[in-house]
Interface confidence: medium
């Protein structure tokens, strides 16, 4: 299973649930479904209050038990390390794959943290991060922001990923804006 890591804003906007959590338990494989589940301890929720309703405590995250079908395998053994997890809700359960945005909270730039905490949501309604995978590429719409990080370096490590968000400038127009300049 291969996929290009998304811009964190795309991950935020396309996910049902975005949380901060620790992986605390030993993973278990369900012998019937061949899904494995990781026990987590949620410390913050950034998106998903409405989707979850009253069941606002997520205790497990589910993923296929094989990487060949995009199963996520958690490598860290540090149970106190916090991770940003952006996933989908299926039947009230949080599901992730290799293609989901899952990253140590400490590895995120301050700008990205600010994005997940409050800013990315502003761009979800109107704006689209549009990946530019090969030159030439052009904007399809005024509401698109061209994402060129992959042309230069790893998509997660690029300047646009780590420091910028695609936000409305005026109706029908979105531009890259610095997350540093946003109110903390």
């Amino acid at each position: 299973c291969t996929c290009v890591p998304p811009h964190p804003q795309t991950a935020f906007c396309n996910s049902d649930l975005v949380i901060r959590a620790k992986f605390v338990g030993t993973p278990e494989v369900n012998q019937t479904t061949l899904y494995q589940r990781y026990e987590i301890k949620m410390t913050k929720m950034y998106k998903g209050f409405q989707a979850l309703g009253d069941a606002a405590d997520i205790r497990f995250v589910y993923t296929p038990a094989m990487e060949s079908v995009c199963g996520y395998f958690h490598r860290s053994h540090n149970r106190s390390e916090e991770f940003l997890i952006a996933g989908k809700l299926q039947d009230g359960l949080l599901h992730i794959t290799t293609c989901s945005f899952v990253a140590p909270w400490n590895s995120l730039s301050l700008a990205q943290r600010r994005g997940f905490t409050k800013t990315y949501t502003v761009g979800c309604e109107e704006c689209t991060v549009f990946p530019c995978l090969s030159i030439p590429c052009k904007l399809q719409s005024g509401t698109h922001c061209l994402w060129t990080d992959q042309l230069l370096q790893g998509s997660e490590k690029g300047f646009q990923s780590r420091h910028l968000a695609c936000l409305p400038r005026e109706p029908g127009l979105c531009t890259w804006q610095s997350l540093r300049s946003q109110i903390a």
Partner: antibody, heavy 116, light 108 residues
Framework: EVQLLESGGGLVQPGGSLRLSCAAS????????MSWVRQAPGKGLEWVSA????????YYADSVKGRFTISRDNSKNTLYLQMNSLRAEDTAVYYC?????????WGQGTLVTVSS | EIVLTQSPGTLSLSPGERATLSCRAS???????LAWYQQKPGQAPRLLIY???SRATGIPDRFSGSGSGTDFTLTISRLEPEDFAVYYC?????????FGQGTKVEIK
């Protein structure tokens, strides 16, 4: 007591087809993922395919993808492996095994020989 | 693709001796997805250890598993005559159900 009994093996020509069956008893069949594992004469074990309890998810080794199809009939407690476009290198004892990711019960195997 | 390499290929020991079998993965394997099997001639394999260190039902306590990451070990503390067989390690997940090539434990 868990029992798995394979059948359907035999001699087949290259390019031919064969359908293996595995009759299961002694456990709740529909709640267990099942797998096929094979062993060529004098060689080691090679996983072939797996299927979830409901039959909704199937998995294959690259060596058989597109040629073999795993299925199950939970009403008959039976696992199947349909093998098409058979090659000489498919010659092996085929075992059905209960569960995954580890295989806690195995059948005694059925020999498939692909030869002209 | 992940590869599991078992060593040694053959282990020649006497009953009562300690056997140490190694399984090395080409990349990190999830501990809960690693298992060991025993196979005797003409028989189906039998699950010995799952989750790298948990003994399967009915397996004597002379069998133990350990390890994490890329290095795993099966230890038989005192070999009994019925322990002479081929042993396979197996992982699930990175590439489905990959087996090692096996270690034969034979009577010296």
């Amino acid at each position: 007591e868990v029992q798995l009994l394979e059948s359907g093996g035999g001699l087949v020509q290259p390019g031919g087809s064969l359908r293996l069956s595995c009759a299961a008893s002694g456990f709740t069949f529909s709640s267990a993922a099942m797998s096929w594992v094979r062993q060529a004469p004098g060689k080691g074990l090679e996983w072939v395919s797996a299927i979830s309890g409901s039959g909704g998810s199937t998995y294959y080794a690259d060596s058989v993808k597109g040629r073999f199809t795993i299925s199950r009939d939970n009403s008959k407690n039976t696992l199947y492996l349909q093998m098409n476009s058979l090659r000489a290198e498919d010659t092996a004892v085929y075992y059905c095994a209960k569960s995954a990711p580890m295989f806690d019960y195995w059948g005694q195997g059925t020999l498939v020989t692909v030869s002209s | 693709e992940i590869v599991l390499t078992q060593s040694p290929g053959t282990l020649s020991l006497s009953p009562g001796e300690r056997a140490t079998l190694s399984c090395r993965a080409s990349q990190s394997v999830s501990t809960h997805l690693l298992a060991w099997y025993q196979q005797k001639p003409g028989q189906a394999p039998r699950l010995l250890i799952y989750g790298a260190s948990s003994r399967a039902t009915g397996i004597p306590d002379r069998f133990s598993g350990s390890g994490s990451g890329t290095d795993f070990t099966l230890t038989i503390s005192r070999l009994e005559p019925e322990d002479f067989a081929v042993y396979y390690c197996q992982q699930w997940g990175l590439t489905p159900a990959m087996f090692g090539q096996g270690t034969k434990v034979e009577i010296k």
